[in-house]
């Protein structure tokens, strides 16, 4: 009689993560008597996957009834496949022995490859806000995919970015892989409503890529522009001075009025107006009693925006001039920007 052969007809099997893998194996003879066992890998370190008579293999079922008379089909199914299950599986015939059964003949092996979807890309931006014209870095990470081939693209408001670096790890063979990409984005004043998108395409996604997004509103800080103007006289000795705080983001802002360097009033931006580009405008006014001053008054509008060093703008109020004349000149002297740090 011809010597028993163990036949594994499939050189390779490709299975999606979560599905069931069928590993086929048949023997050509019933002799010698002894069990069939399945292993992953070869050599002394190989892992026992299924032993018909003994052991706990909750994910493994046999395709046919191994105890049926004249059964020579030793195929198995492995349920709920994960990337960690990838490898070469061997169907091995043992001959009855004592104290241990003796390996008699092995099949040629079936390579199980697992297709696993990448996780949803997670995009993260810089820890601190940055101002327009600065370049900031965004990272995108996705994990757990197999095979290794993957495509990653970056977009800002639908426009593809080119300044990025991507790594897929590990470099060598692995059960699953991770991708890490860093993109550089130059901020503009109009970026409050902008979005950065990381798009990942993989064979398991069937042409429907995964996307991760980051809103630049979390990253950008648009510093305000200040304008101090003197309004027409409201009463005989009173002058109304306004400080226009324009185009700032985020909203967190505190304004302090100083008269000749002395704090007159501090307020926090509350009722702001929003511009189309997502930035905010706010106006504060100060009623100055001119008769209380003998000399010229230097009025300073000092703004602390989002915890940054204060910026200020000053306006010189000439007390010597008649209030009515002074009030009619809305383009009164403006000393220009006088930026300084206040602590």
């Amino acid at each position: 009689e011809e010597e028993l052969q163990v036949i594994q007809p499939d050189k390779s099997v490709l299975v999606a993560a979560g599905e069931t893998a069928t590993l086929r194996c048949t023997a050509t003879s019933l002799i010698p008597v002894g069990p069939i066992q399945w292993f992953r890998g070869a050599g002394p370190g190989r892992e026992l996957i299924y032993n018909q008579k003994e052991g706990h293999f909750p994910r493994v079922t046999t395709v046919s009834d191994l105890t049926k008379r004249n059964n020579m089909d030793f195929s198995i199914r492995i349920g709920n496949i994960t990337p960690a299950d990838a490898g070469t599986y061997y169907c091995v015939k043992f001959r009855k022995g004592s104290p241990d059964d003796v390996e008699f003949k092995s099949g040629a092996g079936t390579e199980l490859s697992v297709r696993a979807k990448p996780s949803a890309p997670v995009v993260s931006g810089p820890a601190a806000r940055a101002t327009p014209q600065h370049t900031v870095s965004f990272t995108c990470e996705s994990h757990g995919f197999s095979p290794r081939d993957i495509t990653l693209k970056w977009f800002k408001n639908g426009n593809e970015l080119s300044d990025f670096q991507t790594n897929v790890d590990p470099v060598g063979e692995s059960v699953s892989y991770s991708i890490h990409s860093t993109a550089k984005v130059v901020l503009t004043r109009e970026d409050v409503h902008s979005q950065v998108i990381c798009e990942v395409a993989h064979v398991t996604l069937q042409g429907d890529p995964l996307r991760g997004t980051a809103n630049l509103s979390e990253t950008i800080r648009v510093p305000p522009t200040l304008e101090v103007t003197q309004q027409p006289v409201r009463a005989e000795n009173q002058v109304n001075v306004t400080c226009q705080v324009r185009k700032f983001y985020p909203q967190r802002l505190q304004l302090t009025w100083l008269e000749n360097g002395n704090v007159s009033r501090t307020e926090t931006a509350s009722t702001v107006t929003e511009n189309k580009d997502g930035t905010y405008n706010w106006m504060s006014w100060l009623l100055v009693n001119v008769s209380a001053h003998r000399d010229d008054v230097k009025l300073t509008c000092q703004v602390e925006h989002d915890g940054q060093p204060a910026v200020s703008k000053s306006h010189d109020l000439k007390v010597s001039a008649h209030p009515k004349e002074q009030g009619s000149n809305t383009a009164a002297e403006n000393t220009g920007s006088n930026e300084r740090n206040i602590y």
Epitope: L48, E54, D65, L66
Partner: antibody, heavy 114, light 110 residues
Framework: EVQLQQSGAELVKPGASVKLSCTTS????????IHWVKQRPQQGLEWIGR????????KYDPKFQDKATITADTSSNTAYLQLSNLPSEDTAVYYC???????WGQGTLVTVSA | DIVLTQSPASLAVSLGQRATISCRAS??????????MQWYQQKPGQPPKLLIY???NVESGVPARFSGSGSGTDFSLNIYPVEEDDIAMYFC????????FGGGTKLEIK
């Protein structure tokens, strides 16, 4: 549902024999080994032996070789443990268990007493 | 026969603390790359209940508080955090050559 149903408690005299049964359901009886395990009161677990119901191949712990006989009847999906020449030290709970470690019978208490 | 030496014989642990039980085999229980070592929990009047199989695999339905580790000849069962329901006897078992059991560890609450 997998079940291993063991026969009821036995009171036997020293020197006598007893045959315990383990009737299985919910799985292919011939698929896996059936093991028998002894547990004396407040003691540990002792492996007695096992049978392959597919071909009646048996193995025993040498200590039980002359004491125990394990058989199987595939027509009724039942495994048996026969214990002979019982001394009082064989007073114990005897369990049958499937080769997958998970499924155990509820145990049979054998009391050897004059 | 492969002899399994389990220690300690009894163990008193405070609720929420860690319990570690060791099991040493007289020879390797490796079957190729797989350690054929199991851990069971047994409560009075009940058959043993499988907790861990093949040294480190947690049986379905067993709380994640239970974990197993080791290979070759040295194995351990960890329970963390210990709960009231864990009061029981614990046994290791090898199936590399037939079956043998460790002597058992009685877990009590301090």
């Amino acid at each position: 549902e997998v079940q291993l149903q063991q026969s009821g408690a036995e009171l036997v005299k020293p020197g006598a024999s007893v045959k315990l049964s383990c009737t299985t359901s919910g799985f292919n009886f011939k698929d896996m080994y059936i093991h028998w395990v002894k547990q004396r009161p407040q003691q540990g677990l002792e492996w007695i032996g096992r049978i392959d119901p597919e071909n009646d191949d048996t193995k025993y712990d040498p200590k039980f070789q002359d004491k125990a006989t394990i058989t199987a009847d595939t027509s009724s999906n039942t495994a048996y443990l026969q214990l002979s020449n019982l001394p009082s030290e064989d007073t114990a709970v005897y369990y049958c268990a499937r080769g997958n470690y998970v499924h155990w019978g509820q145990g049979t208490l054998v009391t050897v007493s004059a | 026969d492969i002899v399994l030496t389990q220690s300690p014989a009894s163990l008193a642990v405070s609720l929420g603390q860690r319990a570690t039980i060791s099991c040493r085999a007289s020879e390797s229980v490796q079957y190729y790359g797989t350690s054929l070592m199991q851990w069971y929990q047994q409560k009075p009047g009940q058959p043993p209940k499988l907790l861990i199989y093949a040294a480190s695999n947690v049986e379905s339905g067993v709380p994640a508080r239970f974990s197993g580790s080791g290979s070759g000849t040295d194995f351990s069962l960890n329970i963390y955090p210990v709960e009231e329901d864990d009061i029981a006897m614990y046994f290791c078992q090898q199936s590399r050559r037939v079956w043998t059991f460790g002597g058992g560890t009685k877990l009590e609450i301090k």
